[in-house]
């Protein structure tokens, strides 16, 4: 049994890290493998993750790591029974992938402006709470080429756009994702999308 692609891990920097790897051939991850993880600290528990399959040869493990701080460093040991397949380490603060924003809502009754709001997925006492900025993707449900990204470089989880910038009488969808520049994070997954009908009417022009 051989590891083809070594485990790579990302952390949501609140309670969970996710590690993925690939084996040399088809593997029943939960039956054959265990990922053992331990905080590098004088006395700390050695916790264990039962991996799940991610494709025929791919495995994924979710590691519980609450109360994360910047100095935290974990040792990782991948076992097949009593055989150690791979040994490595993981520092959550250096591999941050934020949680996806939540509760995306579109308000269409604000004069000629669309107001999009969402909630920061972190509690105020978390390090990432004030570090997140966002990207909002809006697209036409019937026309995949009619898609745009709005960068929200401020921390307020809102976006205002003129309804007139979108086609009238068309259903649109929006989704939002987050990243933390100061942590050199990757982008979060997209939030679930929300749908609305753009009923904006062009004002009648008099000649």
């Amino acid at each position: 049994m051989k590891v083809l692609q070594e485990p790579t891990c990302v952390s949501d920097y609140i309670s969970l890290s996710t590690c993925e790897w690939k084996m040399g051939g088809p593997t029943n991850c939960s039956a054959e493998l265990r990922l053992v993880y331990q905080l590098v600290f004088l006395i700390s528990e050695t916790n264990m993750c039962v991996p799940e399959n991610n494709g025929a040869a791919g495995c994924v493990c979710h590691l519980f790591m609450e109360d994360m701080v910047g100095a935290d460093n974990y040792t990782l040991d991948l076992w097949a029974g009593q055989q150690l397949l791979w040994k490595g380490s993981f520092k959550p603060s250096e591999h941050v992938k934020p949680k996806a924003p939540e509760n995306l809502t579109v308000y269409t009754n604000v004069s000629e402006t669309l107001l999009l709001t969402w909630s920061n997925p972190y509690p105020p006492d978390n390090y990432l709470y004030e570090k997140l900025t966002y990207a909002v993707n809006i697209w036409n449900e019937n026309d995949p080429t009619d898609s745009r990204i709005y960068d929200v470089t401020y921390q307020e989880p809102t976006l205002r756009i003129a309804a007139s910038t979108l086609k009238s009488g068309v259903s649109y969808r929006a989704r939002v994702r987050a990243w933390a520049q100061s942590y050199n994070s990757t982008w979060s997954e997209w939030s679930p999308s929300t749908k609305w009908y753009n009923a904006y009417k062009e004002p009648f022009e008099k000649h």
């Epitope: 264990m48 993750c49 979710h62 519980f64 609450e66």
Partner: antibody, heavy 129, light 109 residues
């Protein structure tokens, strides 16, 4: 230094109730581990009672014999775990230990305790009339 | 899950090799730990994950086994090793933790 200190033990009459406390110091009681209770009757072996996950999800596990009469809970703000014991019987007489436990998890919803790494000194509960 | 530990007691001399066994009633993979307990004290973790030595535990202690059969070995018994030893099996199917009945190691003679 990490340590656990139990309190709340003492003499109680059959049918009575008692709440034991376990104060954690030197580590955060809300971090990724389980907090558990184990007991030992005089001159007898060790018997696991219950565990509660110390982090946000707070999932609990009980020995089959303890369900209904015993309840484990926590207060993360006080770094304390509790064991509420009701309808006590003479056979519940024992030293009650608090212990911190490692865990195994599968996915994000299935997580269970699997060994006790750090123990308190114990508190004696005597059930007698 | 039931954990059957044997022997329930044994007498040995300093320097002896001592073996204690624990049998689980179902497959518990490597979810087994070993503890040492002295009178009036809480148990002390010796071995976890069937064969991993806990922090600060002397290397004369070792554990082996997986599935249903497990062994704790003390390669050369020292005066401070006279105590009671317990195994602990964990079943992830039920989330339960069951201790063995214990093995009391006493001085021969």
């Amino acid at each position: 230094e990490s340590q656990l200190v139990e309190s709340g033990g003492g003499l109680v009459q059959p049918g009575g109730s008692l709440r034991l406390s376990c104060a954690a110091s030197g580590f955060s009681s809300s971090s990724a581990h389980y907090m558990c209770w184990v007991r030992q009757a005089p001159g007898k072996g060790l018997e696991w009672i219950a565990c509660i996950y110390a982090g946000s999800r707070g999932s609990t596990y009980y020995a089959s014999w303890a369900k209904g009469r015993f309840t484990i809970s926590k207060d993360n703000s006080k770094n304390t775990v509790y064991l509420q014991m009701n309808s006590l019987r003479a056979e519940d007489t024992a030293v009650y230990f608090c212990a911190r436990a490692a865990f195994v998890n599968r996915g994000v919803s299935w997580i269970w305790p699997y060994y006790f790494s750090l123990w308190g000194q114990g508190t004696l509960v005597t059930v007698s009339s | 899950i039931q954990m059957t530990q044997s022997p329930s007691s044994l007498s040995a001399s300093v320097g002896d090799r001592v073996t204690i066994t624990c049998q689980a009633s179902e497959d518990i993979e490597s979810y087994l730990a070993w503890y040492q307990q002295k009178p009036g004290k809480p148990p002390k973790l010796l071995i976890y994950r069937a064969s991993t030595l806990a922090y600060g535990v002397p290397s004369r202690f070792s554990g082996s086994g997986s599935g249903t059969d497990f062994t704790l070995t003390i390669s050369s018994l020292q005066p401070e090793d006279f105590a009671t030893y317990y195994c602990l099996g964990s079943s992830y199917s039920t989330g339960s933790n069951i201790f063995g009945t214990g093995t009391k190691v006493t001085v021969l003679g």
